[in-house]
Interface confidence: medium
C-alpha cells in the first residue's frame, strides 16, 4: 500500500521528503506483536500504557495492570508470571551492549494489588525471568545467579564465583552476547520449571580492549572489556544444570562436552530444552565448520546429565562455515527425540530436514532453489516456516505451513495472496499450540499486523494498519522503488533501485550506492522504509542502489560461501560490477557516483573507493572495520579462519583498508566513527587515518565523542546532516 501516484494536476499539492522528516521519524511505522500467554489470550500495552489482557475467543479484554501502577515505579516494561499472580515491573533501564542492560525490578502482587515487600530484589539486576510454570524467579546480580521459589521468599544463591569482567554466570560476556547467542541472557528454564540450565563464561585470560569515555569529569574514565580479537584467547564456557525444587540437595551439575568438540578450542552455541528431563546443547569448534548437537538426559540415580554418543549429531560444512550467520537451532517434535532443523541440502540450499536417528538419514522436508529461513512452530499436525520461495524473489518472506500429521502431506502458503502488492515480507508470532497467530507484514507497502485463526488461517482482525502513516504520506512525493536482478558471469546480483519521484530515463542522475555486504546479510528486501536514502531520492534527485553480491544470504551456498576465507574481495568486486551495469542503463551521470556504508558496509565502501577503478567520485565510511585482526574472534574466524602463518594470515594482511591508502588520493573520503564503539573499535578508523596521513592523502573525518557503534541520539541528526552536506557538495547540488 504505497500511496497512489497522482497526476500532474495534483502535483502542486505534493511535497518532497525533507531531512527533518527523516530525523524526526515523521514517517515511522508501528507493528503489533501480541504477548501471548495462552492459546487464545495475549497481553498488550495500550496507547495509554495500561496492560490489557485480550481473549480472542470471548472477545473480552480487561486491564490487568493500570498505567497508574506502572507510573508509580516509572516502569518501562513488565512481565506476567505464568500463574498470573505476579507481575514484574522494570525501571531504571541502563543500556550496556547490543542486547544487555541493567534495570531495577519491582514485583507486584495481582491478588492484593500491592507491591511485594520484604526480600526485595537487589539493584541493578542484569537479567530476570519467571519460570515457565508458576512464579519462581531466576535473576542475575553482579554476575551471579539467584533463585526465588516465590517472589517474597529470600533468594537462594546458585553461583558464587561471578566477578566483573572475569566470570559471567547466566549472562554472556561481550563476544558471546554479540556474536554467538544474540541475547542478554545465558540461562534457560526447563519447560515445567524443574531445572535451570546456565552458562558460565570465564574471561580471565582474554585480552582487554580499553578506550576512554570522556564524560563530563576532569579525567576521562577508561572502559575495559574482555574482547577476543581474531586469533586471541577466547572465553572458556561451561554449562551447568540445577534442580530448582531442591537446589541445595546436589547443586549445579555440569553437562559434559562432546569429546570431538572438547579436543580443541570450542564454543557453546545454544541450548534447547526438550522436556523437563531432556536437554539439547549445540557446540561448535573454534574453526567453525563443525557443529555438534548433543541430546542429554537426566539420570535420576546419579542426579547427573548423560549425553550418549548415539545422541550426538554432527553438522559439517565442506564449502564454508557451518550454518548461515548462526548454526540453526532444532525444533523438536512431540515425540521429544526427533526434530526439525534447517541446514544445507545436497544442492547447497538451506532447507528444513527432519532428523529421527542420524543426520545422514535426515528426511528433507522442503526443497528447491530457494531457502527456508525460519521454523516458527511445530504442532502435532503442522509445521510453520518462512521462506523466499514465492515468485523467486530472494528478498521476500512468506509464511508456509506443511501438514505433518496427515497424508498426503500438503504445503500451503499462508501469506502469498493475502495482500499481494502491499505485503511480501512477513514474520509471524504464534500462540500456544498455534491456535492463533499474528502476521506482521513489513512491506513493501505500509506495514500491517493481523490476527489469524491457526486452523483455517483466516484473518480475524487487523491489529495495526498504520492509518495515520498512510494519511501522513498522502501528500508526500515518495521515490519509486524497483527490485530487479543482473546476471553477470553466472552470478545473480539482485538490486534495489530507489528513483526520484519524477524519474525520467532520458535524464542523467547522480548515483549513491548504499552497501552493507557482510556475510549472510541481505540488503535487497521487499520492505517499507522512509529513511535517509528516501529523502536523497525524493528531495535531492539522487538514484540510490543497494546490491546483494557474493557472500549475501538466502540464495544458496554458492553465493554465500564464495567469500569464505577471503573477505573484502568479491563483495567489493560485485558492487563495482553492478555500478558498471547501472551506467550502461543510460540514466546515471558517471561523473557523480558515490558509495557509503556503515560497519561492514564501511569496510566495503572504503575498499571500493580504494579499488582504483575511477568509478567513484566520493564516499563515506561510518564505523568501518579496517583490518580483520581488529575484529572479534567469533565473527571474524567464522569467515576468515585464523590469522596465523599456517592458516590465513596472508589474506588478513592483504584485506586491510590501510594497505590501500595510496588509492584514496583520487577520491573524496569521509571517515566517521564513535570514540566509544565497543563493537568496531575506534582503533579501526584511527589506523585508516594514520595510514592516510602517512601517505599524505587528504580526507575528511568526523568523530562522535562517547558514542558507540549505533551513533544514536543527537549524534544521529548531526551524522545525517553532515553526510548530506558532503554528498551534495560531491554531486554539486545546491544547498
Amino acid at each position: 500500500l504505497r500511496p497512489s501516484r497522482v497526476h500532474n494536476s495534483e502535483e502542486n499539492t505534493m511535497r518532497a521528503l525533507t531531512l527533518k522528516d527523516i530525523l524526526n521519524g515523521t514517517f515511522s511505522y508501528k507493528t503489533f506483536f501480541p504477548n501471548w500467554i495462552s492459546g487464545q489470550e495475549y497481553l498488550h500495552q495500550s496507547a495509554d500504557n495500561n496492560i490489557v489482557l485480550y481473549n480472542i475467543e470471548t472477545g473480552q479484554s480487561y486491564t490487568i495492570l493500570s498505567n497508574r501502577t506502572m507510573k508509580s515505579v516509572n516502569a518501562s516494561n513488565y512481565g506476567l508470571s505464568p500463574d498470573r499472580q505476579f507481575v514484574y515491573l522494570e525501571s531504571d533501564y541502563s543500556k550496556l551492549w547490543r542486547y544487555s542492560y541493567t534495570a531495577t525490578y519491582y514485583i507486584y502482587d495481582l491478588s492484593n494489588g500491592e507491591f511485594v515487600r520484604g526480600n526485595e530484589l537487589p539493584r541493578p539486576i542484569q537479567y530476570l525471568c519467571w519460570s515457565p510454570v508458576g512464579s519462581k524467579l531466576a535473576y542475575v546480580y553482579q554476575n551471579n545467579i539467584y533463585l526465588k521459589q516465590r517472589p517474597g521468599d529470600p533468594p537462594f544463591q546458585i553461583t558464587f564465583n561471578g566477578r566483573e569482567n572475569k566470570i559471567f554466570n547466566g549472562i554472556p560476556d561481550w563476544v558471546y552476547e554479540e556474536e554467538m547467542l544474540a541475547t542478554k541472557y545465558a540461562l534457560w528454564w526447563s519447560p515445567n520449571g524443574k531445572f535451570l540450565a546456565y552458562a558460565e563464561f570465564n574471561d580471565t585470560d582474554i585480552p582487554v580492549i580499553a578506550y576512554s569515555y570522556y564524560g563530563d569529569e576532569q579525567y576521562p574514565r577508561t572502559i575495559n572489556i574482555p574482547y577476543p580479537k581474531a586469533g586471541a584467547k577466547n572465553p572458556v564456557v561451561r554449562i551447568f544444570i540445577i534442580d530448582t525444587t531442591y537446589p541445595a540437595y546436589v547443586g549445579p551439575q555440569e553437562v559434559p562436552v562432546p569429546a570431538m568438540i572438547a579436543s580443541s578450542d570450542y564454543y557453546f552455541s545454544w541450548l534447547t530444552w526438550v522436556t523437563d528431563e531432556r536437554v539439547c546443547l549445540q557446540w561448535l569448534k573454534r574453526v567453525q565448520n563443525v557443529s555438534v548437537l548433543s541430546i542429554c538426559d537426566f539420570r535420576e540415580d546419579w542426579q547427573t546429565w548423560d549425553c550418549p554418543k548415539t545422541q550426538e549429531h554432527i553438522e559439517e560444512s565442506r564449502t564454508g562455515w557451518a550454518g548461515g550467520f548462526f548454526v540453526s537451532t532444532p525444533v523438536f517434535s512431540y515425540d521429544a527425540i526427533s526434530y526439525y532443523k534447517i541446514f544445507s541440502d545436497k544442492d547447497g540450499y538451506k532447507h528444513i530436514h527432519y532428523i529421527k536417528d542420524t543426520v545422514e538419514n535426515a528426511i528433507q522436508i522442503t526443497s528447491g532453489k530457494w531457502e527456508a529461513i525460519n521454523i516458527f512452530r511445530v504442532t502435532q499436525d503442522s509445521l510453520f516456516y518462512s521462506s523466499n520461495e514465492f515468485e523467486e524473489y530472494p528478498g521476500r518472506r512468506n509464511i508456509y505451513r506443511i501438514s505433518i500429521g496427515s497424508y498426503p502431506p500438503s504445503k500451503k502458503c499462508v501469506t502469498c495472496h493475502l495482500r499481494k502488492e502491499r505485503c511480501q515480507y512477513y514474520t509471524a508470532s504464534f500462540s500456544d499450540y498455534a491456535k492463533y497467530y499474528a502476521l506482521v507484514c513489513y512491506g513493501p507497502g505500509i506495514p500491517i499486523s493481523t490476527l489469524h485463526d491457526g486452523r483455517t488461517d483466516q484473518e480475524i482482525k487487523i491489529l495495526e494498519e498504520n492509518k495515520e502513516l498512510e494519511n501522513a504520506l498522502k501528500n508526500i512525493q515518495l521515490p519509486k522503488e524497483e527490485i530487479k536482478k543482473l546476471e553477470v558471469d553466472e552470478i545473480t546480483l539482485w538490486y534495489k533501485m530507489i528513483l526520484p519521484p519524477q524519474f525520467d530515463r532520458s535524464k542523467k542522475y547522480p548515483l549513491l550506492i548504499q552497501v552493507y555486504g557482510g556475510p549472510c546479510s541481505q540488503s535487497v528486501r521487499s520492505v517499507f522504509a522512509v529513511n535517509w536514502i528516501s529523502y536523497l531520492a525524493s528531495k535531492e534527485g539522487m538514484v540510490i542502489a543497494l546490491v546483494d553480491g557474493r557472500g549475501t544470504a538466502f540464495q544458496g551456498d554458492k553465493l554465500l560461501y564464495a567469500v569464505y576465507r577471503k573477505l573484502g574481495v568479491y563483495e567489493v568486486e560485485d558492487q563495482i560490477t553492478a555500478v558498471r551495469k547501472f551506467i550502461e542503463m543510460g540514466f546515471i551521470d558517471e561523473k557523480r557516483i558515490a558509495i557509503w556504508g556503515w560497519s561492514y558496509g564501511g569496510y566495503v565502501s572504503s575498499l571500493a573507493l580504494a579499488s582504483g577503478t575511477g568509478l567513484f567520485k566520493c564516499g563515506i565510511a561510518v564505523a568501518p572495520v579496517s583490518s580483520w585482526e581488529y575484529y572479534a574472534s567469533v565473527y571474524t574466524e567464522r569467515f576468515m579462519g585464523l590469522p596465523t602463518k599456517d592458516d590465513n594470515l596472508e589474506h588478513y594482511k592483504n584485506s586491510t583498508v590501510m594497505a590501500r591508502a595510496e588509492y584514496f588520493r583520487n577520491v573524496d573520503y569521509l571517515l566517521i566513527h564513535g570514540t566509544a564503539d565497543d563493537n568496531v573499535h575506534f582503533q579501526n578508523s584511527a589506523q585508516i587515518a594514520k595510514a592516510l596521513v602517512n601517505a599524505q592523502v587528504d580526507f575528511q573525518a568526523m568523530w562522535y565523542s562517547d558514542q558507540n557503534h549505533g551513533l544514536s541520539g543527537l549524534s544521529t541528526n548531526h551524522l545525517y546532516t553532515h553526510m548530506t552536506h558532503f554528498l551534495k557538495q560531491c554531486f554539486s547540488l545546491s544547498d
Epitope: 481473549n55 503442522s382 500438503s410 499462508v414 495472496h417 486452523r455 483455517t456 488461517d457 484473518e459 482482525k461
Partner: antibody, heavy 123, light 107 residues
Framework: QLQLQESGPGLVKPSETLSLTCTVS??????????WAWIRQPPGKGLEFIGN???????YYNPSLKSRVTISVDTSKNQFSLKLSSVTAADTAVYYC???????????????WGQGTLVTVSS | DIQMTQSPSSLSASVGDRVTITCRAS??????LNWYQQKPGKAPKLLIY???SLQSGVPSRFSGSGSGTDFTLTISSLQPEDFATYYC?????????FGQGTKVEIK
Amino acid sequence: QLQLQESGPGLVKPSETLSLTCTVSGGSISSSSYFWAWIRQPPGKGLEFIGNIYYSGSTYYNPSLKSRVTISVDTSKNQFSLKLSSVTAADTAVYYCARPSYYGSGNYYFAFWGQGTLVTVSS
Amino acid sequence: DIQMTQSPSSLSASVGDRVTITCRASQSISSYLNWYQQKPGKAPKLLIYAASSLQSGVPSRFSGSGSGTDFTLTISSLQPEDFATYYCQQSYSTPPTFGQGTKVEIK
C-alpha cells in the same frame, strides 16, 4: 449431535434487506473457536460462500458481497444471523448455515449444515 | 479468489459404471480440496477431504486423488444412491470456493 436450523422469511422484496437466523442445538456456539458460516445456492446453480463469524464477533465476508452483508452472533440465544441488504432477484437462493471441522494442517471442510431455507426475492 | 472448474458439468452413467469427475483450481491449492455430494432438496454431504482422505461412513467406492491444481473424484462402481450432484471445494485461501457442480444422471 450438533444441529443447525435456519429461519426467516421466505419472500423478500427487491431493494429490501434479507434477514435470516441460524439456531445451533446440541452444542454451545461459544464453546470453541470454530467459525459459523452462511453459504447460499441459487436454484439449479452452485454453492457460494457468503461469510462467517467467530463467537467473539469477528467476521469475514466474501469480497463479492462484502458491501451488503452483515453477520452477527448472539451467544445467549445460541444463534447467529445474516443480513443482506439491497437484494435483487439474483439473491434468490437456498441459504444454508454451516460449521466446519478442522483436520490436518489448517485444513477444514463443512461438516455440519442446516437443511437450508429458500429465500425468494420478488415484488 | 481461487476459481474452481469442474468437468463435465453433467454426465449420464449406468449402475456399475466407473465414473470420474475432475476439478481444476486456478492456482495451486496443494491438497486443500474437499468433495461433497448433494441430493435434491438436501444439504451437501462431505465425501472426501484433503484431496484423498475418505470421510468416515462414506463407502470405499468413492476415492479422490490429485494435488496442486488438478483433482479427481472417482466412483469405482456406481450405485443407484450415487445419482446426485458433486461439488469440489478449496480451503486453501479465503473465501472458500466451490466448483459449479457435476450432475451424475441415470443413463
